[in-house]
């Protein structure tokens, strides 16, 4: 409940909020969980704590890990966890699932796309917006405050939208990008029994002990907007939330994408600092809609290193 996934790209700013509710006047102490080492509050540090916020200015891949925040009120101390993953910049235009924020849906009447997490940053308008990595141009697109409005939305407008803005901290500027999928509600839709695209059933994925790994559960459910279409991960037949291991988290938002006109939903299971015991678990990708439930199982195995003489 009080563990939150956050992610960003190297050399960009990342600001994370402690997942515990409280007043701005409360003292919040931040620690790097693995070492219990306190995060400094001095702003001259690249990574520093500022009340409920933890700031990476800019972030590095090595910053990935679990951070503990302790919110100290006059009456109680409350603990939360921020599970931070910093990824290398992608060389091509493709934005992988694990960097995507929750999907938004639009129609002719309502086509607002909000820039995710922007409220945490000190930014000034205007935002820059890109679709599938191309800068948006033309009078149909209006960047307004923290969101993009698209006039006369068409099915072609579905896709991945990236907002880019500058965070300012003490006169220094840092770039931030965030991407989310936009789907267009299609009245002429239909639904099918779920088809799981990934993982393949009874697949085995090789992983390195101590490294992070991501498992994507992806399924298609029909064409157009779906009344009920959900994908989720289970561990040994149990919900992720019932499995009290903060290293293993399912991303909050489910990303919706369209493949050949089909409505497909993805969710990513993030496993930090893979341990031997993770290899013993059964990971089930579940896809559910009104037609029924489909399940694909994947297991993890230790990566074999081939030594050539």
């Amino acid at each position: 409940k009080f563990s939150k996934q956050s992610w960003g790209l190297e050399n960009e700013a990342l600001i994370v909020r402690c997942p515990r509710q409280g007043k701005s006047s409360y003292i919040v102490d931040w620690y790097y969980s693995q070492t219990n080492k306190s995060i400094p509050t001095q702003e001259r540090n690249r990574v520093f704590a500022s009340g409920q916020l933890l700031k990476f200015l800019p972030a590095e891949v090595a910053d990935s890990g679990i951070y503990t925040c302790i919110v100290r009120s006059p009456t109680f101390n409350r603990t939360g966890y921020a599970n931070v993953t910093i990824y290398k910049k992608q060389p091509d235009c493709n934005v992988p699932d694990y960097l995507m924020y929750s999907t938004v849906s639009g129609s002719e009447k309502n086509s607002k796309i909000y820039c995710p997490t922007i409220d945490l940053y000190n930014w000034t308008a205007p935002l820059e917006w890109f679709k599938n990595c191309q800068a948006l141009q033309g009078s149909r697109y209006k960047a307004h405050k923290s969101f993009l409005v698209i006039d006369n939305v068409m099915t072609d407008d579905a896709g991945d939208y990236t907002c880019k803005f500058i965070h300012n901290e003490n006169g220094a500027n840092y770039s931030v990008t965030a991407t989310r999928s936009f789907t267009v509600k299609d009245e002429q839709g239909f639904s099918l029994f779920p088809v799981i695209r990934a993982p393949a059933h009874n697949e085995t994925k090789e992983v390195e002990i101590g490294e992070n790994t991501n498992l994507t559960c992806s399924a298609c459910f029909g064409k157009g907007a779906q009344f009920l279409a959900t994908v989720q991960w289970q561990l040994n037949g149990n919900k992720i939330t019932d499995f009290s291991e903060p290293r293993i988290q399912q991303e909050e938002g489910q990303n919706q994408s369209f493949s050949n006109g089909l409505a497909c939903v993805n969710t990513v299971l993030r496993i930090a600092d893979v341990k031997e015991e993770d290899l013993l678990l059964r990971y089930d990708c579940l896809a559910l809609n009104l037609h029924g439930l489909r399940r694909h199982t994947i297991r993890l195995s230790r990566k074999h290193h081939h030594h050539h003489h």
Epitope: K23, S25, V71, S73, T75, F76
Partner: antibody, heavy 117, light 106 residues
Framework: EVQLQQSVAELVRPGASVKLSCTAS????????MHWVKQRPEQGLEWIGR????????EYAPKFQDKATMTADTSSNTAYLQLSSLTSEDTAVYYC??????????WGQGTSVTVSS | ETTVTQSPASLSVATGEKVTIRCITN??????IHWYQQKPGEPPKLLIS???TLRPGVPSRFSSSGYGTDFVFTIENTLSEDVADYYC????????FGAGTKLELK
Amino acid sequence: EVQLQQSVAELVRPGASVKLSCTASAFNIKDDYMHWVKQRPEQGLEWIGRIDPAIGNTEYAPKFQDKATMTADTSSNTAYLQLSSLTSEDTAVYYCALGDFYAMDYWGQGTSVTVSS
Amino acid sequence: ETTVTQSPASLSVATGEKVTIRCITNTDIDDVIHWYQQKPGEPPKLLISEGNTLRPGVPSRFSSSGYGTDFVFTIENTLSEDVADYYCLQSDNMLTFGAGTKLELK
């Protein structure tokens, strides 16, 4: 030592309103949250809601959304609970309690509200 | 809305005996549960906060355990001064009290 002072009792007519007060000593109420809890005679505890006195933000349990109004005056270090359209169901002891967002630690002695004609 | 089912409604024990009270929630709330004691004519008193944390000054005969949806509050070697009503409180989603358990001595 933190103390929360509440009036002992209120007798009110059905259909009327009542405003209960809770004054803190040795503690600045704007530094934490003030919760209100209802306890009917020989019954259990019911959480009414919480207020952040510093900024006036409130959150109510769905059951009390239309019944209760929480306010606070930081200058007098006092929190208030107003109950409207009173019926016999509102006859209860009402506690104020200081705490954080998630729980209460310091409690007042409670105000007994009796609704009777 | 998260609901809490507390049991038993009442129990009677002899001094020195062990008391066990259970609360079950309808949703997974991790360990965000608190335990209160209320003696007749007094306001409730917080004994145990979330994460099974004993509050300062509370005797070690009181303890709690549980995670997810199933929680247990225990009094080892019950004393006569422990006669009271006991309530669990979940604060994962809004705040909800259990219905309470009345503890009496035989």
